[in-house]
């Protein structure tokens, strides 16, 4: 259930050189510095556990400060193949190749990896985000153009002695950051090949990876302030539930979202919030320092445990699901956006969830671990929590079986 198995070499302890190697903020993604090519070209790369391509800007774009210049790399190899990635909104397309890649604040290794050189995009790069590419850390099944394109992490593990595991600590600031503050701020840590004990408190609890495509997990119960939403647990995972560092919000299937909002509204009814707030359209503000965190409920997601009929729960605070935003027009107040939204592609446990926890992507053992993050934002009365075990029966029934078709799965 918890992290009690014997220590394994290279998998535990301290990874000082990798701590604090992420920057950014939940609204625009967390990025790590990487180098590509020979001589090395430095780029900031979005860490995305919801996709599987390593793709970088490779042509001028109004939102990019720099981009990968293949012609300047003596080690670039053209795969003479294009790649096109459409999303529900937006897309990117480019040319496939390989080159030497390393992570300066990561393991001291260089690997030859597949790179999609993005030559054209729409609604992909974000103005002011400070990243120029994306590191898809999920599995080959969802790689584009097909699962034969080996993802970066697979190449890393295959070509080096780095254990098949990484962990993420995303640190929400708890207050809005301007551009210069983001550049100076610590955004968190990506520990490649191990677990750093300094980044969490308490125990790590593991949930099985249901299927190796996205990092798919199974939610078996949802509570708002301890009150069960009382829905058929299949609804929570319709049509899947994934852990995705590249998504800002906690996204919930339509029925679940509606039930959750109804329950959060009821719990916070001492104030009347506009309908637009629950839609993510309107901000709510309070005089600086007076945000009434206590009127908002905690949200608990129960995840399938590693042992039959056993589950554990992760609990987030309003400090995670109310995202601080800066607006010059209301700068004298503390303003927030509701960071839970509706999804038509299942539950997405985005930065809103991940900022509460240290999350271990233990690919070697096909499981994801959660522990309370040492950097999560909380107050003197409540803290995020990871607790268990709980007895939960028939958890396998909570998984939704997606009908197999030939259609693309990656329509995010």
């Amino acid at each position: 259930e918890t992290d009690e198995e014997p220590e394994e070499p290279g998998r535990r302890g301290s990874f000082v050189e990798m701590v604090d190697n992420l920057r950014g903020k939940s609204g625009q993604g967390y990025y790590v510095e990487m180098t590509v090519g020979s001589p090395p070209q430095t780029l900031n790369i979005l860490v995305d556990t919801g996709s599987s391509n390593f793709a970088v800007g490779a042509a001028p774009h109004p939102f990019l400060h720099r981009y990968y210049q293949r012609q300047l790399s003596s080690t670039y190899r053209d795969l003479r193949k294009g790649v096109y990635v459409p999303y529900t909104q937006g897309k990117w397309e480019g040319e496939l190749g390989t080159d030497l890649v390393s992570i300066p604040h990561g393991p001291n290794v260089t690997v030859r990896a597949n790179i999609a050189a993005i030559t054209e995009s729409d609604k992909f790069f974000i103005n002011g985000s400070n990243w120029e590419g994306i590191l898809g850390l999920a599995y080959a099944e969802i790689a584009r153009p097909d699962d034969s394109l080996e993802p970066f992490f697979d190449s890393l593990v295959k070509q080096t002695h780095v254990p098949n595991l990484f962990s993420l600590q995303l640190c929400g600031a708890g207050f809005p950051l301007n551009q210069s503050e983001v550049l100076a701020s610590v955004g968190g840590s990506m520990i490649i090949g191990g677990i750093d004990h300094s980044l969490y408190t308490g125990s790590l609890w593991y949930t099985p990876i249901r299927r190796e495509w996205y990092y798919e997990v199974i939610i078996v119960r949802v509570e708002i302030n301890g009150q069960d939403l009382k829905m058929d647990c299949k609804e929570y995972n319709y049509d899947k539930s994934i852990v995705d560092s590249g998504t800002t919000n906690l996204r919930l299937p339509k029925k679940v979202f509606e039930a959750a909002v109804k329950s959060i509204k009821a719990a916070s009814s001492t104030e009347k919030f506009p309908d637009g707030f629950w839609l993510g359209e309107q901000l709510v503000c309070w005089q600086a320092g007076t945000t009434p965190w206590n009127i908002f409920p905690v949200i608990s997601l129960y995840l399938m445990g590693e042992v039959t009929n056993q589950s554990f729960r992760i609990t987030i605070l309003p400090q995670q699901y109310l995202r601080p935003v800066e607006d010059v027009a209301t700068s004298q107040d503390d303003c927030y956006k509701f960071a839970i939204s509706q999804s038509s592609t299942g539950t997405v446990m985005g930065a809103v969830i991940m900022e509460g926890f240290y999350v271990v992507f233990d690919r070697a053992r096909k499981r994801i671990g959660f522990a309370v993050s040492a950097c999560h934002v909380h107050d003197e009365f409540r803290t995020a929590a990871v607790e268990g075990p709980f007895v939960t029966l028939d958890m396998e029934d909570c998984g939704y079986n997606i009908p197999q078709t030939d259609e693309s799965t990656l329509m995010t």
Epitope: N127, K272, D275, G280, Q282, L283, C285, D327, T330
Partner: antibody, heavy 116, light 107 residues
Amino acid sequence: EVQLQQSGAELVRPGTSVKLSCKASGYTFTSYWIHWVKQRPGQGLEWIGMIDPSDSYTKYNQKFKDKATLTVDTSSSTTYMHLSSLTSEDSAVYYCARSGVAFPYWGQRTLVTVSA
Amino acid sequence: DILMTQSQKFMSTSVGDRVSVTCKASQNVGRNVAWYQQISGQSPKPLIYSASHRYSGVPDRFTGSGSGTDFTLTISNVQSEDLVEFFCQQYNSYPYTFGGGTKLEIK
């Protein structure tokens, strides 16, 4: 500095259509919804609808759902409003506005005149 | 739809006076009301949000109050540049609606 730059005045024939634009700058375009508001002399302000630039989700005032269509082009940080089957009732000043708390930022106005 | 009623189309005042513009909602809108000022031929300028919070840069002679259905914009020490039109707006529920406006005039 947040700015919403609207397209220029339009003189159009009845029965035709027109597309107004609103170019945003000074903030992360996909982080805030854009609204459109109509103002006719002596008729006050009317909310037409809104669009979320991050995913093009739209919500309309029922009164305008068959009249207005909102779209967005994130590459140019521009929102568009297409008005169809124009009549003299559509002659008005149109504003785009950015969300936040209520509408803290407004475009400078676009005058549409429908005349034969 | 929520009807926002500004019963006085015009109000007479003098420079230096204190004047209160009122707005009534047809149903409870909490404190989700904004006030705008509009000079003829220009865009509305935001003054107040959440019934009583001033937007950045708005002079403190503008004060908002009220909750539920009754709202007031008070201008103390009226200046000549304040002799324009004022609109209230509810942003509690869709469709967002505005009051018909109140114009301040010189006595």
